[in-house]
């Protein structure tokens, strides 16, 4: 660290004049010791140029004189009549040889500006790079070549063949010629900034013979891209940043004020405020990547901009896109339950509204899961196959024409509550975001199967009863048989239903169903539910294992409830049993060639589109009481 | 009088960049030297970085612990200078203050400025 002080970057024009002051420490030997102005050559060998000693070198004479002036501790150098072959490093410093006390001074003497008409205009957005074209004659081919950039009359070297390099465009400058080109050098400045717009002059040679060309340089800001959304709809941000920032990491910001702060990136950061509606998703290997946030909110309107760098968060010099979102509050989409709330063992039925002009989409939900960029996999689908872990307890049911389908999820556990997505093949605004929690029950559930252990005997008849409390008397009472394609809803007896609608016997409600005769693929899951018109409520599940009769064992009924079923005289035993046709269906990735953030549960594709709907017992060779 | 005003200050990560700008009011910034100086808590207020022009002539000085890290530059259509600060460190955190004088011999490290700003924060987090 030198004691010696002075400008670091000096900059004029020709025919100029230059006052350079050098500061030194108050001290008696530094203000008498020598003072000495050089010129620093390629071999680090630094030329005298002027001294206080007396010395004036002869292309320094009649214009250029060194003051001390002892009292201030400084001395100046004054320098007039500037060239451009003035330009060049220097030192200014004190003692008897050049090798004492000195600091460096960089001298760029620009030509006066002019703005001439064969100025190349270049136009880029910040943050990409520019490549400016210099064109020279061969005279010139071994000369000095720069780049400088004007400041008012003066022009202050960006970059030289000397390989100096200005401090604000360190990193960001190169200068270089293409293959074996001698009448033409380039110069390539990266990161644009906005205060990197402006006049640049480029030049190869000194003096009068130098060849010398204009660049206009205009940065752009990134014009922000309108886009309107409704209230509750979903947005998808598509960024292109461009192949020089692929291995970046990449982030979605918002602007506030001078800020833009980070909503999510690459690198695992997400603002709270989109916890559960929002994906980041890379789209190649080109650098483009999306965001889509679902649930619209009033506050979520504003200015957007996406970016890359490797910390994640905006720099300035890095590329940008920009967009500015408007939410319309008058929104087509209804509004729903934003939190469901369910306990364990229980059930939730979550209604999902769609475009009721597509009620031939497919529908689909899926578990919206926090690590890294956000992904939702598909649960279950109308042509999608229920996920590993949920089969029995997940069921879609699509309702056509009423632009709303309900899912199902029962046998719930506290590990369920998260964040969930009801979404379509079609109108993609159509998304809505809902968030589970379930606590842990502190009473009875309010179905109960009988018998718990259910198991049905091949070719007998076998009764399974489902007690509902009186709160559920007016409502609609099912059972389903659960399959990989929904819940195809059967034939049941609603026991509580022959009494008086003015007394409730709290222990008598009971819908019953019956397999007569149980044949093998009445094995599964077996659902009771209730339902007011097209709105889903409470559902419980019991597995129904079926097993060959043993030799000789005697056919004993195991429940109370299949007592109680020969009992009814008015019931009619239904000579067949329940069958599914299993339709296994995938969800098509091309539905998602833009949304690959919704991952498909599925593993088998068929081309035709699953029949069994809930609500309709088609598709079945049997029924149940 | 020469009013000047600093803005642009905020919080930054370490490794980030942050620009510094001084708006002076008054009169425009000519044949004037404008310094960055900046000030942590517990320490002594140091010189950054000056700017001083006369005419077309334009001088630039650095502490020697930003220099390569910090460019100061004038705008003359904002009537501003600026301060770009790249590679930014914790120890770079500071109220940092835009300080403007007329004299052109003055040492622009100096304290003898004849107007300074109200300062504006940065935070380097580490």
């Known amino acids: 660290q030198s004691p010696i002080f002075g400008p670091q970057d000096v900059s004029s024009i020709e025919g100029n004049s230059v006052s350079i002051t050098c500061y030194y420490p108050d001290t008696s030997v530094n203000r008498h010791t020598r003072k000495y102005w050089c010129r620093q050559g390629a071999n680090g060998y630094c030329a005298t140029l002027i001294s206080s000693n007396g010395y004036l070198s002869k292309e320094y004479s009649g214009r250029a004189s060194l003051i001390n002036f002892p009292e201030n501790s400084t001395f100046v150098i004054n320098i007039a009549h500037l060239t451009q072959e003035d330009t060049g490093s220097y030192k200014c410093g004190l003692g008897t040889t050049n090798r004492g006390l000195f600091f460096d001074v960089s001298l760029e003497v620009s030509q006066v500006p002019e703005f001439p008409n064969d100025t190349h205009v270049y136009t880029k957005d910040i943050g990409r790079t520019v490549t400016i074209e210099c064109r020279f004659k061969e005279g010139n081919a071994h000369s000095k070549k720069s780049l400088c950039k004007k400041r008012g009359e003066a022009c202050e070297v960006v970059i030289d063949s000397t390989e100096y390099v200005d401090p604000s465009y360190k990193d960001r400058a190169i200068l270089f010629m293409k293959g074996t080109s001698r009448d033409i050098f380039y110069v390539n400045i990266s990161h644009l900034i906005p205060s990197d717009a402006g006049l640049y002059v480029c030049q190869a040679g000194e003096g009068p013979s130098a060849d010398k060309n204009n660049a206009d340089l205009q940065v752009l800001e990134p014009e922000p891209e309108l886009l309107y959304k409704d209230l509750r709809s979903s947005v998808t941000f598509e960024c292109d940043l461009g192949r020089e920032v692929a291995n970046d990491a990449k982030y979605l910001c918002r602007k506030n004020k001078e800020t833009c702060d980070v909503i999510i990136n690459t690198l695992g950061k997400r603002d709270p405020a989109f916890e559960g509606r929002i994906l980041l998703t890379p789209r190649d290997d080109n650098g483009r990547f999306s965001v889509l946030i679902t649930g619209l909110r009033k506050e979520d309107a504003g200015h957007y901009q996406c970016g890359a760098h490797s910390s994640g968060l905006p720099q300035e010099g890095w590329p940008v896109q920009a967009w500015q979102l408007f939410v319309n509050e008058e929104s087509t989409i209804p509004n729903s339950r934003s939190v469901v709330k369910g306990v364990t063992g229980g059930s939730v039925a979550i209604v999902c509204p769609y475009n009721p002009k597509e009620s031939s989409s497919l529908k689909y939900w899926c578990h919206w899961e926090a690590d890294e960029n956000g992904r939702c996999p598909v649960l279950v689908g109308t042509q999608a196959l229920v996920q590993e872990g949920y089969e029995g307890r997940l069921a879609l049911f699509d309702q056509p024409g009423s632009g709303a389908y309900t899912v199902i999820l029962n046998q719930l556990t506290t590990q369920d509550s998260g964040f969930y997505w009801c979404l379509t093949d079609g109108d993609s605004r159509w998304r809505t975001t809902i968030e589970l929690q379930v606590a842990e029950a502190t009473k009875k559930p309010d179905l109960e199967v009988t018998p718990q252990n259910a198991t049905a005997v091949i070719g007998e008849t076998f009764t399974i009863s489902c007690h509902y409390p009186c709160k559920f008397y007016s409502q609609e009472k099912y059972w389903c048989k659960w399959s990989n394609d929904g819940c195809h809803i059967l034939p049941s007896h609603d026991e509580g239903a022959r009494q008086s609608s003015v007394s409730c016997d709290q222990s008598s409600q009971i819908v019953s169903m019956t397999l007569n005769p149980v044949k093998k693929e009445d094995e599964g899951w077996y659902w009771c539910g209730v339902k007011e018109g097209q709105v889903y409520g409470e559902t419980t599940a019991i597995y129904v294992a079926v097993e060959e009769r043993t030799r000789g064992s005697p056919h004993i009924n195991p429940t109370d409830a299949n007592a109680r079923a020969k009992d009814a005289p008015e019931e009619e035993a239904m000579e067949s049993s329940v069958r599914e046709d299993e339709n296994k269906a995938n969800l098509d990735p091309r539905l998602f060639a833009d949304e690959r953030e919704i991952q498909n549960a599925g593993d088998q594709a068929q081309e035709n589109r699953a029949s069994g709907n809930a609500g309709s017992a088609g598709g079945q060779s049997g029924s149940s009481k | 009088e020469v009013q000047l005003v600093e803005s642009g200050g905020g919080l930054v990560q370490s490794g980030g960049s942050l620009r510094l700008s001084c708006a002076a009011s008054?009169?425009?910034?000519?044949?004037?030297?404008v310094g960055w100086f900046r000030q942590a808590p517990g320490k002594e207020r140091e010189f950054v970085t000056a700017?001083?022009?006369?005419?077309?002539?334009?001088?630039?000085y650095y502490a020697d612990s930003v220099k390569g890290r910090f460019t100061i530059s004038r705008d003359n259509a904002r009537n501003t200078v600026d301060l770009q600060m790249n590679s930014l460190k914790p120890e770079d955190s500071a109220v940092y203050y835009c300080?403007?004088?007329?004299?052109?011999?003055?040492?622009?490290?100096?304290?003898?400025?004849?107007?300074w700003g109200q300062g504006t924060l940065v935070t380097v987090s580490s």
């Open positions: 008054g009169r425009t910034f000519d044949q004037f030297t």
């Open positions: 300080a403007g004088q007329m004299s052109q011999w003055s040492d622009p490290r100096g304290d003898d400025y004849d107007s």
């Open positions: 700017i001083r022009w006369s005419g077309s002539t334009t001088y630039r």
